[in-house]
């Protein structure tokens, strides 16, 4: 069966600084040289793009300068980091992988990673 399976962790807890990292791994049915990775957020059945990057196999993953995502790639594995998260950003983050070149094209969509973000408590004023 020539299908592409995408695996990602079920749950991730963001750090107190609003940073969440997870691995998106795909089982490639072909030898792709160009891959596009997109992070989607699903909330109330609405899906929105968080960030996307296209990379050549063996090269680094480059997101746009203003992207909240960074990442590194190693073989069929992509290490994704999302920054600047707040409690209201808690939700399901889906990893979408597309094998762009050479043909044929393949699409793979993960089941999503539930990212929990807890805003840090404000520090109480200290009198010294």
């Amino acid at each position: 069966c020539k299908a592409m399976h995408v695996a990602q962790p079920a749950v991730v807890l963001a750090s107190s600084r609003g940073i969440a990292s997870f691995v998106c791994e795909y089982a490639s049915p072909g030898k792709a040289t160009e891959v596009r990775v997109t992070v989607l957020r699903q909330a109330d059945s609405q899906v929105t793009e968080v960030c996307a990057a296209t990379y050549m196999m063996g090269n680094e993953l480059t997101f746009l300068d203003d992207s909240i995502c960074t990442g590194t790639s190693s073989g069929n594995q992509v290490n994704l980091t999302i920054q600047g998260l707040r409690a209201m950003d808690t939700g399901l983050y889906i990893c979408k992988v597309e094998l762009m070149y050479p043909p044929p094209y393949y699409l793979g969509i993960g089941n999503g990673t539930q990212i929990y973000v807890i805003d840090p408590e404000p520090c109480p004023d200290s009198d010294f």
Epitope: A3, L107, G108
Partner: antibody, heavy 118, light 106 residues
């Protein structure tokens, strides 16, 4: 609102050329793959071509390979289909469609009719 | 190329009845969608990922199946549901559609 509007259809003689356009609005055009799908009179849907994101990667159905060229201008939010060496069996309604975030064709234009006849 | 075969070709039913449409693939399919098309109109996405309803689609429409066998069910036919329905695979190129099932009023 999210919308796709095709134009450029018409009646053309076999062997001649035609260029279809698809104007997109209401979404970030460059973030989506765009397809052309056609439907000959009284028949089903047939996928024609796709162009991805920045426009570098394109795929074509075998019956149109070498004759049709798909392109896009992200600055104008417009998709194109250049059709050369047209044949009788290219007669169809041509639809542009957006490949949604999860891959399915979630937005379609109203279609433009292309008739190839001598 | 993945070939999709829909059955039956035509389904004659009355409003209020249940409609069951089948789509069989020549090889395993990872991503399957269903579309509705009325005369003179563009297709409309109903179901994606085999079983997820698209935005604004009534819950009388449901999709099921995996691998090579898929089903679209309309629990109670409304007058506006009489149309042609197409399945499509979108997991790999070339993108392919079934030949369609026409749901007509009996």
């Amino acid at each position: 609102q999210v919308q796709l509007v095709e134009s450029g259809g018409g009646v053309v003689q076999p062997g001649r050329s035609l260029r279809l356009s698809c104007a997109a609005s209401g979404f970030t055009f460059s973030s989506y793959g765009m397809h052309w799908v056609r439907q000959a009179p009284g028949t089903g849907l047939e996928w024609v071509a796709v162009i991805w994101y920045e426009g570098r990667n394109k795929y074509y159905a075998d019956p149109v390979k070498g004759r049709f060229t798909i392109s896009r201008d992200n600055s104008k939010n417009t998709l194109y289909l250049q059709m050369n060496s047209l044949r009788d069996d290219d007669t169809a309604v041509y639809y542009c469609a957006r490949a949604g975030d999860l891959g399915a064709f979630d937005i379609w234009g109203q279609g433009t009719m292309v008739t190839v006849s001598s | 190329e993945i070939v999709l075969t829909q059955s039956p070709g035509t389904l004659s039913l009355s409003p209020g009845e249940r409609a069951t449409l089948s789509c069989r693939a020549s090889q395993s399919v990872s991503y399957l969608a269903w579309y509705q098309q009325k005369p003179g109109q563009a297709p409309r996405l109903l179901i994606y990922g085999a079983s997820s309803r698209a935005t604004g689609i009534p819950d009388r429409f449901s999709g099921s199946g995996s691998g090579t066998d898929f089903t679209l069910t309309i629990s109670r036919l409304e007058p506006e549901d009489f149309a042609v329905y197409y399945c499509q695979q979108y997991g790999s190129s070339p993108w392919t559609f079934g030949q369609g099932t026409k749901v007509e009023i009996k």
